[in-house]
């Protein structure tokens, strides 16, 4: 009598997460009688996946009708595969007994699960930085398998090179995570700029996932200040203008001081945006020259985005 063979024809099978995996197994003889059991892993710690005779295995079904006469096909189908199902599966023949006795194992089929990476999440610095400073952006994506993955950073379509990327864990795992940090040098023109983290993986069929961050969340463009005097009006009133230009974000408070005393405080709101995303604001102060005996020192004080105030002063000459 020929020795019974347990044949697992595929060394490996790769399945997309969410799909079903078919693990093939045939035996060469009905004899000796006894169950076929499927295990994940080998040795004492192996996990029972399916036993045709005993137990209930809701995610596992027999491919062939096991009740069909002369059935020697003990292939199984595992539904709704997740990365946690990855591993080597063994089809094992037992001889009927009390208890059943293991007789022969198939060579094993390695199931690898192709799992898509999660949508990349890009986070920027906690506090804003000014132009000519370098800020860091982080991109994270999780749950992918296999481990091979490509991550690229772009700023306004140009690839960034100051990048550090790690894929964890380093060893074998059911799924992996990637974390990458890009260092970006800010310029005054970056209010409308965008950084993109692009992740390419075998599961994505050449259609990479992208995560974005707007530099507008990370940048502060401090204002330029200019104080000028318009010509004296007939009623002895002088119009002094404080021009605050090229700032971002809009959060700005302007205070006029006359000889060091607060004259008026204004908050910027609903300003029109410049092409580069920055804002301009002009404030006027009318000074009644006839009410003063000495020259008047006017100060335009600007507090931008919670930063220390910036002053620009101007003296209005009072003629004797």
């Amino acid at each position: 009598e020929e020795e019974l063979q347990v044949i697992q024809p595929e060394k490996s099978v790769s399945v997309a997460a969410g799909d079903s995996a078919t693990l093939n197994c045939t035996v060469s003889s009905l004899i000796p009688v006894g169950p076929i059991q499927w295990f994940r892993g080998a040795g004492p710690g192996r996990e029972l996946i399916y036993n045709l005779k005993e137990g209930h295995f809701p995610r596992v079904t027999a491919v062939s009708d096991p009740t069909k006469r002369n059935n020697m096909d003990f292939s199984i189908r595992i539904s709704n595969i997740t990365p946690a199902d990855a591993g080597t599966y063994y089809c094992v023949k037992f001889r009927k007994g009390s208890p059943d006795v293991e007789l022969k194992s198939g060579a094993g089929t390695e199931l690898s699960v192709r799992a898509k990476p999660s949508a990349p999440v890009v986070s920027g610095p906690a506090v804003r930085a000014t132009a000519e400073h370098t800020v860091s952006f982080t991109c994270e994506s999780h749950g992918f398998s296999p481990r091979d993955i490509t991550l690229k950073w772009f700023k306004n379509g140009n690839e960034l090179s100051d990048v550090q990327t790690n894929v964890d864990p380093a060893g074998k795992s059911v799924s992996y995570s990637i974390r990458s940090t890009a260092r970006v040098l800010l310029t005054r023109r970056d209010v409308h700029s965008q950084v993109i983290c692009e992740v390419a993986h075998v599961t994505l069929q050449g259609d990479p996932l992208r995560g974005t961050a707007n530099l507008s969340e990370a940048i502060r463009v401090p204002p330029f200040l200019e104080v000028t005097q318009q010509s004296m009006r007939a009623d002895n009133q002088v119009n002094v203008t404080c021009q605050v230009t090229k700032f971002y974000p809009q959060r700005l408070q302007l205070t006029w001081l006359e000889n060091g005393n607060v004259s008026r405080t204004e908050m910027a709101s609903a300003l029109p945006e410049n092409k580069d995303g920055t804002y301009n604001w002009t404030s006027w102060l009318l000074v009644n020259v006839s009410a003063h005996r000495d020259d008047v020192k006017l100060t335009c004080q600007v507090e931008h985005d919670g930063q220390p105030a910036v002053n620009k002063s101007f003296s209005v000459k009072v003629s004797a």
């Epitope: 009905l30 004899i31 009688v33 045709l52 005779k53 005993e54 137990g55 209930h56 009708d65 096991p66 009740t67 069909k68 006469r69 002369n70 059935n71 009927k96």
Partner: antibody, heavy 121, light 111 residues
Framework: EVKLEESGGGLMQPGGSMKLSCVAS????????MNWVRQSPEKGLEWVAE??????????HYAESVKGRFTISRDDSKSSVYLQMNNLRAEDTGIYYC????????????WGQGTTLTVSS | DIVLTQSPASLAVSLGQRATISCRAS??????????MYWYQQKPGQPPKLLIY???NLESGVPARFSGSGSGTDFTLNIHPVEEEDAATYYC?????????FGGGTKLEIK
């Protein structure tokens, strides 16, 4: 330990009805075909009926001598198999065994102790 | 229906000798290279106990002195060496097709 325990036998008059029950334990009942076999001094061992699995749509098969009179059924949630016997005849007298079919081939590896049915006026 | 004829109806065998029981089917019970014949032992007051499956394979827990052979329509159960506890009635049964049928039995007596 596999156990099959029949109940429901007794003395019946010809033309009467009786239901035999068999409760199984020690194995996953829903994964096995179940059978009834009877034994009498006159006819020896005689296969009566078989019921298959849910995946086989609980297909049933009967010996010609009981077709139309006997009905085999199962309740997997109770690990039980039944034999409803109607229009009983004297020749239905015997010991009725509940049997597990191990390998879907009338491989009768476990038998209950049997329950006795006597049909007599 | 397939009719199974057992012979002899009874036999007496001395302790330690060979007992041979024959079972002949009215039609072949072999398909796809397998012989769908089973042998059972029954002692008084007990249900039958499976000894041999698929004509020649020893059921788990059955002593090796029991053996089966044959194919097609002719099958044999051998017991050697016979022991006192082997005194019983032996039945053949087929599953070649529905309905399953049993032989009439062979009563073995130990001398």
């Amino acid at each position: 330990e596999v156990k099959l325990e029949e109940s429901g036998g007794g003395l019946m008059q010809p033309g009467g009805s009786m239901k035999l029950s068999c409760v199984a334990s020690g194995f996953t009942f829903s994964n096995y075909w179940m059978n009834w076999v009877r034994q009498s001094p006159e006819k020896g061992l005689e296969w009566v009926a078989e019921i298959r699995l849910k995946s086989n749509n609980y297909a049933t098969h009967y010996a010609e001598s009981v077709k139309g009179r006997f009905t085999i059924s199962r309740d997997d949630s109770k690990s039980s198999v039944y034999l409803q016997m109607n229009n009983l005849r004297a020749e239905d007298t015997g010991i009725y065994y509940c049997i597990r079919d191990y390998d879907y081939d009338a491989y009768f590896d476990y038998w209950g102790q049997g329950t006795t049915l006597t049909v007599s006026s | 229906d397939i009719v199974l004829t057992q012979s002899p109806a009874s036999l007496a065998v001395s302790l330690g000798q060979r007992a041979t029981i024959s079972c002949r089917a009215s039609k072949s019970v072999s398909t796809s290279g397998y012989n769908y014949m089973y042998w059972y032992q029954q002692k008084p007051g007990q249900p039958p106990k499976l000894l041999i499956y698929l004509a020649s394979n020893l059921e788990s827990g059955v002593p090796a002195r029991f053996s089966g052979s044959g194919s097609g329509t002719d099958f044999t159960l051998n017991i050697h060496p016979v022991e006192e506890e082997d005194a019983a009635t032996y039945y053949c049964q087929h599953s070649g097709e529905l309905p399953y049928t049993f032989g009439g039995g062979t009563k073995l007596e130990i001398k």
